[in-house]
Every structure is written in C-alpha cells, then in structure tokens.
Interface confidence: low
C-alpha cells in the first residue's frame, strides 16, 4: 500500500524518497527487499542511503527491484516500499510511456512546465530543456529555476518536454533527465473557495471494531489547473504524520476533473483494525487553497451488529 514507483536511466543519478514520512529525528533504514540486505550509508558506495533518501550514483539496470525503507521512532516503525526500475538508454528519440512523468496542462496565461523530481537533487541552474528531443531555442522559451516558461502558448507547443540537469554529490557530477507531456488548454480556469463534497459536515460514520475503515476527503477548488490546492486529514487537531498512530494513515486519492470542468482532489484516511479509542477521536477533513481553508468534521460510531433474534 505504501509503495512508490520510481524510475531512471542507466548511468544517470536517481534519488528516491521513502514513501513513509516521519519527523527528521527518526532514523530510516533501507533494505534491498529481494535479499533483505541492508543498504549502506557510506557515501563511497555507488548506492547508499541518506536518511529518507536512497541514492543511486549512478544507477545501473541491475539496481532494479523493490527497496524497503523503515522509519523508526521510539514508539513505532513505519514501513514503505520503493519499486525502482532502471532502464537502458534509448537509441532513438522516442521517450516510452513508462519513462514519462505526469502530464501538465497550460494555457496562454499559465505555461509553466516543472522539471519532475528535481527538488530531490542538489542541482544548480540553468536547466536544459528539450522538446521532442530538440534543444529549445528562441526568446519564447525561458528556463527559470526549476521550470520552463513558454510565452504566447499555441496548440503547437503541446508535446513531450525533457529537462536535463546535473546533480552534484561530494564534488562528483551526475546527469539526470526527466520527461513529461505538456498539453495546451484553450479555456481559462479560475479558482474558488474550497468546496468539500465529502464528507458532509458533522457526519457520523459507522464502523466495525476490528475491521478496516476508509474515510475520503473530497474537495473541489475551481476550473482548470489548480496549482495551489490541497486536501488532508487531521486527528484531534493534529497532522496525521505528527499524531503517531501507525494504524491511521492518509493516502492521496484521485485528482478528478469533472465534465463541468471542476478540478477536485481526494485524500483517503485509512484506519486499520478499528479500535474503541478511535471512536473518541475527531476527524477533520481540510481543504485549502489561496482563498482559505474549509473544514468538515467526522466522528466514528460503532456499527451495531444485526440482531437476528428480534
């Protein structure tokens, strides 16, 4: 469940973050799942662990596999899995689907293309950008920090964009490339104060003790691409990551775009093995963007087993 797909190209740097998060003071141990062999932390190794990060400097096809990260705190452990695939470099220009990051949309007024995963790396500007393998040239294209800006976007600007940058680790340089599709939208979007579609305000959700329960926080933020919007859960006024109950975790759900153009986000709260004390907690679904924050509160109640004798 707490698994993340990561991919890269041979002879390039790849840095993977543990899909389970914890406080900075928690230690994180990494293992190669197939052999249960511990990943070393010494930086002289080609593959080494550095806290929440697993670094392949550079990556090799043989590194492909599932890596386990265990976030250790004084009171609990959290386990995550990184499913890493390293591919051979393509000889032709085509970037296969399995190497593509999420598609982004732009319009005449908003044409930023962010370089995927770059925040994990120690890089310095400028980035190099390519479209369909051709280096971008001309005054319409501006590489700005970790994104590309295209002026006066036209439908012909749609295509696959690749960013290339250098990761520096202890004085050694490693190349990284990442590709994503860019589509052009005609209509102008807008954002509005978040609207929570689920759960209803002060909803009571029936759950069975000992069973698993899921709560979905679903909210809409406007029309078109929403760059500053988030949904999340809180327990008794505390972030899930800070609450410290490993049975209760939140997981990003679907980004939805409806036929009426509304852009919505889901966040699923998963409660494993529901306990009596879970019924005493207050569950807040929070939706927020630049307009502000909206909160819907949910409480759990015990589902009474059906009495067959009545």
């Amino acid at each position: 469940k707490f698994s993340k797909q990561s991919w890269g190209l041979e002879n390039e740097a790849l840095i993977v973050r543990c899909p389970r998060q914890g406080k900075p003071s928690y230690t994180v141990d990494w293992y190669y799942s197939q052999t249960n062999k511990s990943i070393p932390t010494q930086e002289r190794n080609r593959v080494f662990a550095s806290g929440q990060l697993l670094k392949f400097l550079p990556a090799a096809v043989a590194d492909s596999g599932i890596y386990t990260c265990i976030v250790r705190s004084p009171t609990f452990n959290r386990t995550g899995y990184a499913n890493v695939t390293i591919y051979k470099k393509q000889s032709d220009c085509n970037v296969p689907d399995y190497l593509m990051y999420s598609t982004v949309s732009g319009s005449e007024k908003n044409s930023k293309i962010y370089c995927p995963t770059i925040d994990l790396y120690n890089w310095t500007a400028p980035l190099e950008w390519f479209k369909n393998c051709q280096a971008l040239q001309g005054s319409r294209y501006r590489a700005h920090k970790s994104f590309l800006v295209i002026d006066n976007v036209m439908t012909e600007d749609a295509g696959d964009y690749t960013c290339k940058f250098i990761h520096n680790e202890n004085g050694a340089n490693y190349s990284v490339t990442a590709t994503r599709s860019f589509t052009v939208k005609d209509e102008q979007g807008f954002s509005l104060f978040p609207v929570i579609g689920a759960p209803a305000q002060n909803e009571i959700k029936e759950v069975e003790i000992g069973k698993n329960a899921n709560l979905t926080c679903s909210a809409c933020f406007g029309k078109g691409t929403q760059f500053l919007a988030a949904v999340l859960w809180q327990l008794n006024g505390t972030k899930i990551t800070d609450f410290g109950e490993p049975r209760i975790q939140q997981e990003e759900g679907q980004n939805q775009s409806f036929s009426n153009g509304l852009a919505c986000l889901d966040m699923v709260l998963r409660i494993a093995d529901v306990k009596e004390e879970d019924l005493l907690l207050q569950y807040d679904c929070l939706a927020l963007n630049l307009h502000g924050l909206r909160r819907h509160t949910v409480r759990l109640s015990r589902k009474n087993p059906i009495d067959h004798h009545s």
């Epitope: 998060q21 406080k23 900075p24 962010y114 995927p116 925040d119 994990l120 120690n122 700005h144 920090k145 970790s146 994104f147 760059f227 500053l228 919007a229 988030a230 999340l232 809180q234 972030k239 990551t241 990003e252 929070l286 927020l288 963007n289 630049l290 924050l293």
Partner: nanobody, 122 residues
Framework: ESGGGSVQAGGSLRVSCAAS????????MGWFRQAPGKEREGVAS???????TYADSLKGRFTISKDNAKNTLYLQMNNLKPEDTAKYYC?????????????????????WGEGTQVTVSS
C-alpha cells in the same frame, strides 16, 4: 530566528532565519506569527523556486525572500502596526508531500524555529 525587537508604529523591521541542509534547499519555507491568546497564523511563504505567497490581510506591507548562498530566510516588515505585535516563527515543510504546493498554512510545515518577538507600540 533573529531580528525581532520593539519598534514604533509605522516603522520597519527585518527578521531572519538561518536554516540548514535539506530543510533549507528542498522545501516550502514560511513565516508565521502568533499573538498572545490567538492561533498561529500564516504570514508568507516561498517555495524552492522562489515563488512567494502572502496572507491577504498584509496588503503588501511584508516581503519574504531568501538568500540561497547563506541558507537564510528573511521577512521584511514595513509600515508596522500595533496589531502586528506577535512572536514570529520561521518554518519549513514539504508542502503536504504534493508537488509544488507552498502555502503559508500550518499543515504544510514539518520543521519550526523557536520564534522571535516583535512588538509594535503606537
């Protein structure tokens, strides 16, 4: 954090926050403030690309910036008012773990400074 202190209404102050490592370079960073008896509120935030976001109520009086070479975050406060009196906190976070979301909300932040007091007298 440093740079707090007392100032007359209409005056200016600049508070700064020295950060380290990944906490500084890879994250959404922001300034928050908490007045006595009130909830902590977001003031401004800046992401790893340098894009800034401000609380609506500030009406352009505050400016957030950062110096990557010095790993330092700044908040320039101009035309200060008595209602700006509060303890100011610097914070950093992963923006909900979602890509490129950086808003000055408590929920976006994972790391917090100790705070510096700003007092504005009329």
């Amino acid at each position: 954090e440093s740079g707090g202190g007392s100032v007359q209404a209409g005056g200016s102050l600049r508070v700064s926050c020295a950060a380290s490592g990944y906490t500084y370079s890879s994250y959404c960073m922001g300034w928050f403030r908490q007045a006595p008896g009130k909830e902590r509120e977001g003031v401004a935030s800046i992401d790893s690309r340098g894009s800034t976001t401000y609380a609506d109520s500030l009406k352009g009086r505050f400016t957030i910036s950062k110096d990557n070479a010095k790993n330092t975050l700044y908040l320039q406060m101009n035309n200060l008012k008595p209602e700006d009196t509060a303890k100011y906190y610097c914070a950093a976070g992963d923006g909900y773990g979602l890509e490129h979301i950086c808003i000055p909300h408590y929920y976006a932040m994972n790391y917090w400074g100790e705070g510096t007091q700003v007092t504005v007298s009329s």
